[in-house]
């Protein structure tokens, strides 16, 4: 049988983004998001 | 876009403090949140501390965190911050810049707008 393995060739990157909660509602403070492969997740 | 520029830099001894002050020309300036980066000699940029267009929230690197204090008057379009406590690791040239609403304040690509620097040197 053959054997796959899943190799992308690439590193997927993450990053931490802040932003104010101030500019999307009238919260305060500040609201960290994590970007991965270029998507903003929670 | 907005024009800014920095003042305040100096040589301080360690465990000194200064107070770095921004500038800002243009009517428009209470719309962009505001940070401050620094970049030491042969290294690259770096977030120290943003505050958002009201001046109610502010946000900070963990490396300056409960020594240094940004704030800002949109009554004289200025930003401040207050750098206490300071350590030889400061050293650096500490840039103002402008970022608008809902882009990430802690990443120097949201950054439209930069002044040109102030030094700041900490040494005995």
């Known amino acids: 049988d053959a054997e796959f393995r899943h190799d992308s060739g690439y590193e997927v990157h993450h990053q931490k983004l802040v932003f104010f909660a101030e500019d999307v509602g009238s919260n305060k403070g500040a609201i960290i998001g994590l970007m991965v492969g270029g998507v903003v997740i929670a | 876009e907005v024009q800014l520029l920095e003042s305040g830099g100096g040589l301080v001894q360690p465990g000194g403090s200064l107070r770095l002050s921004c500038a800002a020309s243009?009517?428009?300036?209470?719309?962009?949140?505001m940070g401050w980066f620094r970049q030491a000699p042969g290294k690259g940029r770096e977030f120290v501390a943003a505050?958002?267009?009201?001046?109610?929230?502010?946000y900070y690197a963990d490396s300056v965190k409960g020594r240094f204090t940004i704030s800002r008057d949109n009554s004289k379009n200025t930003v401040y911050l207050q750098m206490n406590s300071l350590r030889p690791e400061d050293t650096a040239t500490y840039y103002c810049?402008?970022?608008?609403?809902?882009?990430?304040?802690?990443?120097?690509?949201?950054?439209?707008?930069w002044g040109q620097g102030t030094l700041v040197t900490v040494s005995s």
């Open positions: 243009g009517r428009t300036f209470n719309n962009y949140n």
């Open positions: 505050v958002s267009r009201s001046g109610v929230s502010t």
């Open positions: 810049a402008a970022a608008y609403r809902g882009t990430a304040i802690n990443v120097r690509r949201s950054y439209s707008s």
